[in-house]
Interface confidence: low
C-alpha cells in the first residue's frame, strides 16, 4: 500500500436546500483503471461512512440508489455533492481515495472539508 496525496477544500457552506458540493482531487502516481471514493464524516471523535462509490476511469460514479451522494469524475478530480443535509449534519467530511486496480494499491485520505449547514428559517405564509 502506497500513500497518495488527496486535496479538498477546507470549508464549504451548504445551500439553503441542504446541498453541499466540493471537489476531491488526488495525485495519481499511475494510470488507475478502477478507483474507489469514500466520504467519511468526523464529528465528536466518531468517524462514519457517508457514502462510497467505485468507478472505472472515464465512467460515471455510481452511488447506491438511496445514497445522499452524487458525483462526477474528470481525470483525477471527483466532484462530490451531498444532499439532504441539516444543521445536525455539520461536520468534517473526509475524502478517501483508493486506487484499486491495477496494482500497486494506493490509498489517499484528505484533510477533510468542514461543511456548515444552517437550517433555513421557515418562510411566513408559505405553503410548502
Amino acid at each position: 500500500c502506497k500513500a497518495m496525496h488527496v486535496a479538498q477544500p477546507a470549508v464549504v457552506l451548504a445551500s439553503s436546500r441542504g446541498i453541499a458540493s466540493f471537489v476531491c482531487e488526488y495525485a495519481s502516481p499511475g494510470k488507475a483503471t478502477e478507483v474507489r471514493v469514500t466520504v467519511l464524516r468526523q464529528a465528536d471523535s466518531q468517524v462514519t461512512e457517508v457514502c462510497a462509490a467505485t468507478y472505472m476511469m472515464g465512467n460515471e460514479l455510481t452511488f447506491l440508489d438511496d445514497s445522499i451522494c452524487t458525483g462526477t469524475s474528470s481525470g483525477n478530480q471527483v466532484n462530490l455533492t451531498i444532499q439532504g443535509l441539516r444543521a445536525m449534519d455539520t461536520g468534517l467530511y473526509i475524502c478517501k481515495v483508493e486506487l484499486m486496480y491495477p496494482p500497486p494499491y494506493y490509498l489517499g485520505i484528505g484533510n477533510g472539508t468542514q461543511i456548515y449547514v444552517i437550517d433555513p428559517e421557515p418562510c411566513p405564509d408559505s405553503d410548502f
Epitope: 500500500c1 469514500t38 467519511l40 468526523q42 466518531q46 468517524v47 462514519t48 461512512e49 457517508v50 457514502c51 462510497a52 462509490a53 447506491l64 438511496d66 445514497s67 473526509i94 478517501k96 483508493e98 484499486m100 500497486p104 494499491y105 485520505i109
Partner: antibody
Framework: EVQLVESGPGLVKPSETLSPTCTVS????????WSWIRQPPGKGLEWIGY???????NYNPSLKSRVTISVDTSKNQLSLKLSSVTAADTALYHC?????????????????WGQGTTVTVSS | DIQLTQSPSFLSASVGDRVTITCRAS??????LAWYQQKPGKAPKLLIY???TLQSGVPSRFSGSGSGTDFTLTISSLQPEDFATYYC?????????FGQGTKLEIK
C-alpha cells in the same frame, strides 16, 4: 454481548443461488462493517466481501460477478447471495463484524464471528 | 491479490513449549496483519491486530511482531487450550486474504 447467528438452506443445487442470512443480536448493526467469509471443508478462510450498515459494499474480485451482500437494519440482519453455484462453493459460511474505524484511523480486525452455516452444493 | 504463506503448516508441541508461527506476504503490507485462532467446530477468534497489538481479553502469552513482508506469532508457554489452527490475515489492500493456516497439535 454481540452475537452473530447464520442461517439458511443447507443444500443448494448447482447453478442455483445460495443465500445465507446473519442475524445480529445484543447490539446494533449500525456503525460497523459486516463481512462474509467462507471455509470449504478441511480448508482455509476466504473473504467474500463486506457491507457497511449504510449499504455500501466491497467484494472479492474473484467472486464479484456472482455476489450480492445486503443489509436490513430494521431486522438487524445481513444476507449473502451467491449465484450460479458449483460444488466448489460448498463451504461453511461465516459472518463477522469489523470495527468501524477501519476506513479511517485504524483497523481492529474482525472481532466478532458467527459459528457459520454449512452450505452444500449438490444435485 | 496479496498471498500469505504460513509456516509450518503443521506443528507438534508440548504444554509449556514456546512456539513461533511465521506468515510471509507476497508484497509489503506494512503492519496491516491480524492473527486468528480457530478450534474445530468453532468460529475464528481474533488474537492480534496491527501485527503486534493484543486483542482485549487475549492472554499475554500470545504476541505478534513483524512489518513489511515477514510476521510472527509467538506463544510463550503453550497451554492445553492453545492447540488449534492459526491464521494470519492481511488488510493492506482488497481483497482481504488469509494464510493457509497452521495446525498446532499436541506432541
Amino acid at each position: 454481548e454481540v452475537q452473530l447467528v447464520e442461517s439458511g438452506p443447507g443444500l443448494v443445487k448447482p447453478s442455483e443461488t445460495l443465500s445465507p442470512t446473519c442475524t445480529v443480536s445484543g447490539g446494533s448493526i449500525s456503525s460497523y462493517y459486516w463481512s462474509w467469509i467462507r471455509q470449504p471443508p478441511g480448508k482455509g478462510l476466504e473473504w467474500i466481501g463486506y457491507i457497511y450498515y449504510s449499504g455500501s459494499t466491497n467484494y472479492n474480485p474473484s467472486l464479484k460477478s456472482r455476489v450480492t451482500i445486503s443489509v436490513d437494519t430494521s431486522k438487524n440482519q445481513l444476507s449473502l447471495k451467491l449465484s450460479s453455484v458449483t460444488a466448489a462453493d460448498t463451504a461453511l459460511y461465516h459472518c463477522a463484524r469489523e470495527d468501524n474505524w477501519r476506513n479511517y484511523y485504524y483497523y481492529y480486525g474482525m472481532d466478532v464471528w458467527g459459528q457459520g452455516t454449512t452450505v452444500t452444493v449438490s444435485s | 491479490d496479496i498471498q500469505l504463506t504460513q509456516s509450518p503448516s503443521f506443528l507438534s508441541a508440548s504444554v509449556g513449549d514456546r512456539v513461533t508461527i511465521t506468515c510471509r506476504a507476497s508484497q509489503g503490507i506494512r503492519s496491516y496483519l491480524a492473527w486468528y485462532q480457530q478450534k474445530p467446530g468453532k468460529a475464528p477468534k481474533l488474537l492480534i491486530y496491527a501485527a503486534s497489538t493484543l486483542q482485549s481479553g487475549v492472554p499475554s502469552r500470545f504476541s505478534g511482531s513483524g512489518s513489511g513482508t515477514d510476521f510472527t506469532l509467538t506463544i510463550s508457554s503453550l497451554q492445553p487450550e492453545d492447540f488449534a489452527t492459526y491464521y494470519c490475515q492481511q488488510y493492506n489492500s482488497y481483497p482481504y486474504t488469509f494464510g493457509q493456516g497452521t495446525k498446532l497439535e499436541i506432541k
